[in-house]
């Protein structure tokens, strides 16, 4: 028969023959030959390989460096890498989450549209008319102005995007 030019899934071509790849979590220690099978061994502690492979070395698990604000979100296995996330109040600077930065706060006049997560920063929005924020915060939304009418009061000072309205008593007409 003709020697193969392509192999099945989970195999690789070597010296005109198809050999088994190593399963995830294992590395290649000896290629197959005309007379011998592929030999694979499990990755060591703190190592992984996540695909069918012919790698001679396993990859090291990612280290979640607390000095960079990182912590382990999901411990790695022989088949998966460790997933890092950021400490409370911090978020990743990239998709790979190699370091963290402090969550941004929304300045007065702006409210939190979306609270930050371990992987995304705070999203702020300007307070629209009828709403205000007088604090710098990573959690506070824009608050609606106080409704003086419902308290049987009148507006003494108009509100802004940074301040609430000031209500006062209605002027009584004297007889």
């Amino acid at each position: 028969p003709e020697p193969p030019t392509a192999c099945r899934e989970k195999q690789y071509l070597i010296n005109s023959q198809c050999c088994s790849l190593c399963q995830p979590g294992q590395k290649l220690v000896s290629d197959c030959t005309e007379f011998t099978e592929t030999e694979c061994l499990p990755c060591g502690e703190s190592e992984f390989l996540d695909t069918w492979n012919r790698e001679t070395h396993c990859h090291q698990h990612k280290y979640c460096d607390p000095n960079l604000g990182l912590r382990v979100q999901q411990k790695g296995t022989s088949e998966t890498d460790t997933i890092c996330t950021c400490e409370e109040g911090w978020h990743c600077t990239s998709e790979a989450c190699e370091s963290c930065v402090l969550h941004r706060s929304c300045s007065p006049g702006f409210g939190v549209k979306q609270i930050a997560t371990g992987v995304s920063d705070t999203i702020c929005e300007p307070c629209p008319v009828g709403f205000f924020s007088n604090v710098s915060s990573a959690f506070e939304k824009c608050h609606p102005w106080t409704s003086c009418e419902t308290k049987d009061l009148v507006v003494q000072q108009a509100g802004t995007n940074k301040t609430d309205v000031v209500c006062g008593p209605q002027d009584r007409l004297r007889a």
Partner: antibody, heavy 116, light 107 residues
């Protein structure tokens, strides 16, 4: 059938360099790792490192880093090992052997003698 | 580095004897062990790989056994052509390392 043909014996001066070769035949040269192994007279075997001709990637035993340089010439299916700054401790037979991990095929060996 | 220890440098045998050569690894190498035979002036020859698999063309009187740290090469019935040096090798981790060798001699 697989054959690994090594270059002939070398007599070199201390401090000099020597380049030995290993010509492969009988298989697809780029598919199998080529290893180099040292054997001093009447002694055991020491693994120097491997080169994968398909990619040129090299893995060397720390003990030989800086002293052994492994290369290949794909056009002639030949692997080379350059040994530099030789001392009397480097007087030995050097073998090339193919395959990863276990060594199914061996060259006949190259005797390197380092003289003062 | 993993140290492979062949405690017997020499072994005296007689044709027809059952001979066992041992090899101990300084840490587990699972089953990634090969055995080689080397005769004077020749290259080593692969006998056993993966601790217990006989390489093609190797007579069935040669048997490999063991896993983890303790391994053995057994010659069921010693023949005169088996007089040689025998080396174990681990290929579980880098650098690959060999035992110091055991020389079989005639009593």
């Amino acid at each position: 059938q697989v054959q690994l043909q090594q270059s002939g014996p070398e007599l070199v001066k201390s401090g000099a360099s020597v380049k030995i070769s290993c010509k492969a035949s009988g298989y697809t040269f780029t598919d199998y790792y080529i290893n180099w192994v040292k054997q001093r007279p009447g002694q055991g075997l020491e693994w120097i490192g491997w080169i994968f001709p398909g990619s040129g990637s090299v893995y060397c035993n720390e003990q030989f880093k800086g002293q052994a340089t492994l290369t290949v010439d794909r056009s002639s299916s030949t692997a080379y090992m350059l040994l530099s700054s030789l001392t009397s401790e480097d007087s030995a037979v050097y073998f090339c052997a193919s395959s990863l991990g276990k060594f199914a095929y061996w060259g006949q060996g190259t005797l390197v003698t380092v003289s003062a | 580095d993993i140290v492979m220890t062949q405690s017997q440098k020499f072994m005296s045998t007689t044709v027809g004897d059952r001979v066992s050569i041992t090899c101990k690894a300084s840490q587990s190498v699972v089953t990634a062990v090969a055995w080689y035979q080397q005769k004077p002036g020749q290259s080593p020859k692969l006998l056993i790989y993966s601790a217990s698999n006989r390489y093609t063309g190797v007579p069935d009187r040669f048997t490999g056994s063991g896993s983890g740290t303790d391994f053995a090469l057994t010659i069921r019935t010693m023949q005169s052509e088996d007089l040689a040096d025998y080396f174990c090798q681990q290929y579980s981790s880098y650098p690959y390392t060999f035992g110091g060798g055991t020389k079989l001699e005639i009593k």
